[in-house]
């Protein structure tokens, strides 16, 4: 389970509501962390064992996911065709 | 070098107490989950406890439940066992384990029996009148 | 409990598979040279070797069945080997009994 505890919000760009967020995160057993949603999460230590990241749902709700060559990271494909790509080192 | 050191070993009487501690170095130490493992005479190798990177997390084996208190302190890198009501089942070598995995910043994290990568030498406790 | 057989034997230059059933999450293997010495990791994480421990020795995982396979066994890999991982339940670590494994 995770939960936000400091939002920082960025005041030079006031349409950005917030810029970073801190979150606390307590994984069980056989859990570590990850992302879900594009947000720190716990996930299933199998996925990221097997580097088969786009089960952890990394990417925002509408968006698709697929996994870069090599299972080096994934990228999340927005509506419009944007692209976020995230490596894992 | 990971390098993990045991001491607080020796003879100990039935009935009394143990306090084991395990220095760690050569690692970041606030990220991995911990365990202490011990090898008695009669059992082999068996869970004794284990404890979050964070220290937020506990848990103990079915043979020391109720009798043992395992801490950490990620300011010395040390992680303490602490036995009480010491019988003579408790003999045996004590060995401090780490987990591969490190857990990010923000995140507490379990170690995992299966992913142990780094062994103390091992302490030896004796319990006997 | 851990199932895993008591003793295995093998010639200098065979191949020897361990295997290791029960238990869930990941798999390690621990090689002890005698009771109460070290412990050493030789596979952990089902498939992962220590930088210093040899090629030789691999694991790999098949369900909840994690084999470990020594190619091209040599003297020194006289031992008994333990594997470890946590119960069914999830809720604490488990040892199985040890493999002696004996180099003719």
């Known amino acids: 389970t995770c939960e936000v505890i400091a939002a920082h919000r960025d005041s030079s760009q006031p349409r950005r509501t917030i810029a970073r967020q801190t979150a606390r995160c307590a994984c069980r057993k056989g859990q570590i962390a990850g992302t879900t949603r594009a947000r720190p999460a716990c996930v299933d230590a199998r996925i990221i064992k097997t580097k088969q990241w786009c089960d952890m749902l990394p990417c925002l709700e509408g968006e698709g996911c697929d996994l870069l060559i090599n299972r080096s990271g994934w990228t999340c494909t927005q509506p419009g065709g944007r692209i976020k790509t995230t490596t894992v080192s | 070098a990971v390098t993990l050191d045991e001491s607080g070993g020796g003879l100990q009487t039935p009935g009394g107490a143990l306090s084991l501690v395990c220095k760690a170095s050569g690692f970041t130490f606030s990220s991995h989950g911990m365990f202490w493992v011990r090898q008695t005479p009669g059992k082999g190798l068996e869970y004794v406890a284990e404890?979050?990177?964070?220290?937020?997390?506990?848990n103990y084996g079915s043979a020391v439940k109720g009798r043992a208190t395992i801490s950490r302190d990620n300011g010395q890198s040390t992680v303490r066992l602490q036995l009480n009501n010491l019988r003579a089942e408790d003999t045996g070598t004590y060995f401090c384990a780490r987990s591969t995995y490190e857990c990010p910043g923000g995140f507490s994290c379990w170690g995992d029996t299966g992913q142990i990568d780094a062994w103390g030498h091992g302490t030896e406790v004796i319990v006997s009148s | 409990a851990l199932t895993q057989p008591s003793s295995v034997s093998a010639n200098p230059g065979e191949t020897v598979k361990i295997t290791c059933s029960g238990g869930?999450?990941?798999y390690g293997w621990f090689q002890q040279k005698s009771p109460g010495s070290a412990l050493v990791t030789v596979i952990?994480?089902?498939?992962e070797r220590p930088s210093d421990i040899p090629s030789r020795f691999s694991g790999a995982l098949s369900g909840s069945t994690n084999t470990l396979t020594i190619t091209g066994v040599q003297a020194d890999d006289e031992a008994v080997y333990f594997c470890?991982?946590?119960?069914?339940?999830?809720?604490?670590?488990?040892f199985g009994a040890g493999t002696t494994l004996t180099v003719l």
């Open positions: 869930s999450y990941s």
């Open positions: 952990y994480w089902d498939d």
């Open positions: 404890i979050t990177n964070d220290g937020s997390g506990t």
């Open positions: 470890g991982t946590e119960d069914i339940s999830g809720t604490a670590g488990v």
